[in-house]
Interface confidence: low
């Protein structure tokens, strides 16, 4: 029994004076606590606790369930204990079958013994299955068997406490270990869409998905730069043992322009926190903005191809798109597609493929697009560059030689005289008159130029060349002169 120096309070003394006592089932348990300031006896086993204010604890017919720790406490709060085993061959274990273990921590399989003298106190797997190779345990007859450093893989493990009695193995009732996972990473959070574009009055609803190993993860929707509590609805699922999913849905039934902003879904666990944001933009009405991808004034050579390309933003989605030329709608030769397959995409591309353009196909090509709120259009002015074509070359009754040429850009007409039979006409002749004939006509067609010279200036046989040219190319026509005596006999025009 404990002894202390006089004057100091001392713990109570217990009779019988030993730390452990073994009695047989049916025998009497008689424990005496001696202390001037006796307060109470306390009995503890598993989760059961009993108290007795008498200084003598008497159990007339002991049962296995009387196995446990008996503690006597005095008024100074000092105590002394004795552990009593009630040996019952028919009930070797007391059990509390609830068995929870936190990952990486130790957990106690609560199967204290009623007989400390049995051997090979250990754990065994159910139905003869072996225990996991890495499972370590420490037996304690008074408390049970401590499993060291519980692993996630032990979840749902079926166990028995086991002892050898008279050469035979005896098993306790079965235990099912439930492992509470440790947080070893921050929660995984995702949002149904990264951005939302809505018109006033439409419903805003966004769902945050939080994934973690257990349901004790915390989550909430917050509005950036605001403390206002948002209304959320939750759904949750356990997909297997350590795969928990929660969906937190935030709804604004009728969004307003001032609801625009950034909303954050925040989640945390004991390891750390994670967040994801979504942006809400509320507009008072829909819109369409068109961006030409090439210059809206286009010059293209005769016979060549050109692609008229626009990008446009449309919200809500575009409903009608068309390309128009000269009040006619194209049914083919164009394509229209979203710039991205993202559900939030509002950007689109439209392309009109003009192939082997003719000089007559210049003009205004218009792209029109509409949605349920607005219409928009953009025009491309297409000019087709054409090599000059000499429309007429004549000797007029007044003796003038006249050349009329058409092309785009506007052709220039030069005149040359070639004396005799020379092939090269180098001597230039100044025109008497130059006119642009259709400057008041359509702005995209060929431009027609007329130029005249006085043939009376030519006194010798030879050839007059009318040369029409522009940036694209050149074309010539020729007049042949033949004199007989003093008379001009003939003038033959040819190209």
């Amino acid at each position: 029994q404990p002894s202390v120096s006089p004057g100091e309070p001392s713990p109570p003394s217990i009779h019988p004076g030993k730390s452990d006592l073994i009695v047989r089932v049916g025998d009497e348990i008689r424990l005496l606590c001696t202390d001037p300031g006796f307060v109470k006896w306390t009995f503890e086993i598993l989760d059961e606790t009993n108290e007795n204010k008498q200084n003598e604890w008497i159990t007339e017919k002991a049962e296995a369930t009387n196995t446990g720790k008996y503690t006597c406490t005095n008024k100074h709060g000092l105590s002394n204990s004795i552990y009593v085993f009630v040996r019952d061959p028919a009930k070797l274990f007391l059990v509390d079958r609830s068995l929870y273990g936190k990952e990486d921590n130790d957990t106690l399989v609560r199967c204290p013994l009623t007989d400390p003298e049995v051997t090979n106190y250990s754990l065994k797997g159910c139905q003869g299955k072996p225990l996991p190779k890495d499972l370590r345990f420490i037996p304690d007859p008074k408390a049970g068997i401590m499993i060291k450093s519980v692993k996630r893989a032990y979840h749902r493990l079926c166990l028995h406490c086991s002892v050898d009695q008279e050469g035979k193995s005896v098993l306790s009732e079965k235990f099912i270990l439930k492992v509470r996972p440790a947080f070893k990473a921050v929660p995984v959070v995702s949002v149904s869409k990264a951005s939302y574009l809505l018109r006033e009055g439409e419903e805003f609803t966004v769902t945050c998905t939080i994934k973690d190993v257990s349901s004790s993860v915390y989550s909430t929707w917050k509005r950036e730069n605001s403390q206002t509590k948002l209304q959320e609805k939750y759904n949750s699922w356990h997909h297997g043992d350590f795969n928990y999913e929660r969906q937190a849905t935030l709804t604004i039934s009728s969004a307003r322009v001032n609801d625009s902003g950034v909303f954050m879904c925040y989640a945390n666990n004991t390891f750390g926190s994670a967040n994801v944001t979504t942006t809400l933009e509320v507009v008072d009405k829909g819109f369409i903005n068109i961006f030409p991808m090439i210059n809206t004034t286009v010059f293209v050579n005769d016979g060549e191809n050109v692609d008229l390309i626009v990008e446009y933003e449309a919200f809500p989605k575009p409903e009608h798109q068309q390309w128009i030329y000269m009040n006619r709608t194209f049914t083919d030769k164009w394509e229209d597609y979203p710039k991205s397959e993202n559900e939030s995409n509002i950007r689109y591309v439209s392309e009109l493929h003009l192939t082997r353009l003719k000089g007559t196909e210049g003009g205004t090509y218009t792209f029109l697009v509409s949605n349920s709120d607005v219409n928009a259009a953009i025009a491309f002015n297409v000019y087709v560059n054409t090599k000059p074509e000499i429309l007429t070359y004549d000797r007029l009754v007044n003796g003038m030689l006249q050349c009329v040429a058409a092309g785009f850009p506007e052709p220039t007409i030069d005149w040359y005289f070639c004396p005799g039979t020379e092939q090269r006409c180098s001597a230039s002749v100044l025109p008497v008159d130059v006119q642009t004939l259709n400057s008041s006509g359509p702005p995209f067609g060929k431009l027609v130029v007329q130029s005249s010279i006085d043939s009376s200036a030519f006194k010798h046989n030879g050839t007059v060349e009318c040369k029409a040219y522009n940036d694209v190319g050149k074309t010539s026509a020729y007049f042949n002169f033949a004199f007989k005596g003093n008379n001009k006999e003939q003038i033959h025009p040819h190209t």
Partner: antibody, heavy 122, light 106 residues
Framework: EVQLVESGGGLVQPGGSLRLSCAAS????????MAWVRDAPGKGLEWVAN????????YYLDSVKGRFTISRDNAKNSLYLQMNSLRAEDTAVYYC???????????????WGQGTTVTVSS | DIQMTQSPSSLSASVGDRVTITCRAS??????LNWYQKKPGKAPKLLIY???RLQSGVPSRFSGSGSGTDFTLTISSLQPEDFATYYC????????FGGGTKVEIK
């Protein structure tokens, strides 16, 4: 799982007709360009036709223009190829393919069906 | 129309070999070139798009290069599952394929 499943192939006489169908699942069909590509014996892969996502614009290989018609039903997630005036040289395995793009007007085929065989023979 | 010419039309190689296939366009197609793998009885599989961008899930031993009219597909170390026919395809407009290159076991 993104999937395209073709059907409607078979044996047909020259001058005859067939209608191929392609059922799409696992993706937003109405947001993608779709195409038909064929693999003819000894000839290799040949693009046949394609259609834009709303179905308003179509393109064809020169040799099938006027004979083949590509169409789609976005409500049914389905693509079709109506083949008329069939010729022996149209014999091939016909694949339905999803067109995806990089940039603006540049396309590649990222998802293909398993193919359906069309044999044109007398 | 843009014509695509592949060379060689077939080649024999061993596992572990470095294999190069070339593709030439009849006119400049910028970087708008794709490569596909085709095995008998199977659907074509996209390997590379935009000349050099590896499609998701395609092993890194496949690579592409080139621009304008001349392009190359390289398999750095041929594996047993790589024996197949490879096609190039221009993706700018009216999507034409090359004639194919059959890679056979030596």
């Amino acid at each position: 799982e993104v999937q395209l499943v073709e059907s409607g192939g078979g044996l047909v006489q020259p001058g005859g007709s067939l209608r191929l169908s392609c059922a799409a699942s696992g993706f937003a069909f109405s947001g993608y360009y779709m195409a038909w590509v064929r693999d003819a014996p000894g000839k290799g892969l040949e693009w046949v036709a394609n259609i834009n996502y709303p179905g308003s614009s179509t393109y064809y290989l020169d040799s099938v223009k006027g004979r083949f018609t590509i169409s789609r039903d976005n409500a049914k997630n389905s693509l079709y190829l109506q083949m008329n005036s069939l010729r022996a040289e149209d014999t091939a395995v016909y694949y339905c393919a999803r067109g995806d793009y990089y940039g603006t007007t540049y396309w590649y085929f990222d998802v293909w069906g398993q193919g359906t065989t069309v044999t044109v023979s007398s | 129309d843009i014509q695509m010419t592949q060379s060689p039309s077939s080649l024999s190689a061993s596992v572990g070999d470095r294999v190069t296939i070339t593709c030439r366009a009849s006119q400049s197609i910028s970087s708008y070139l794709n490569w596909y793998q085709k095995k008998p009885g199977k659907a074509p599989k996209l390997l590379i798009y935009y000349t050099s961008r590896l499609q998701s899930g395609v092993p890194s031993r496949f690579s592409g290069s080139g621009s304008g009219t001349d392009f190359t597909l390289t398999i750095s170390s041929l594996q047993p599952e790589d024996f197949a026919t490879y096609y190039c395809q221009q993706g700018r407009r009216l999507w034409s394929f090359g004639g194919g290159t059959k890679v056979e076991i030596k």
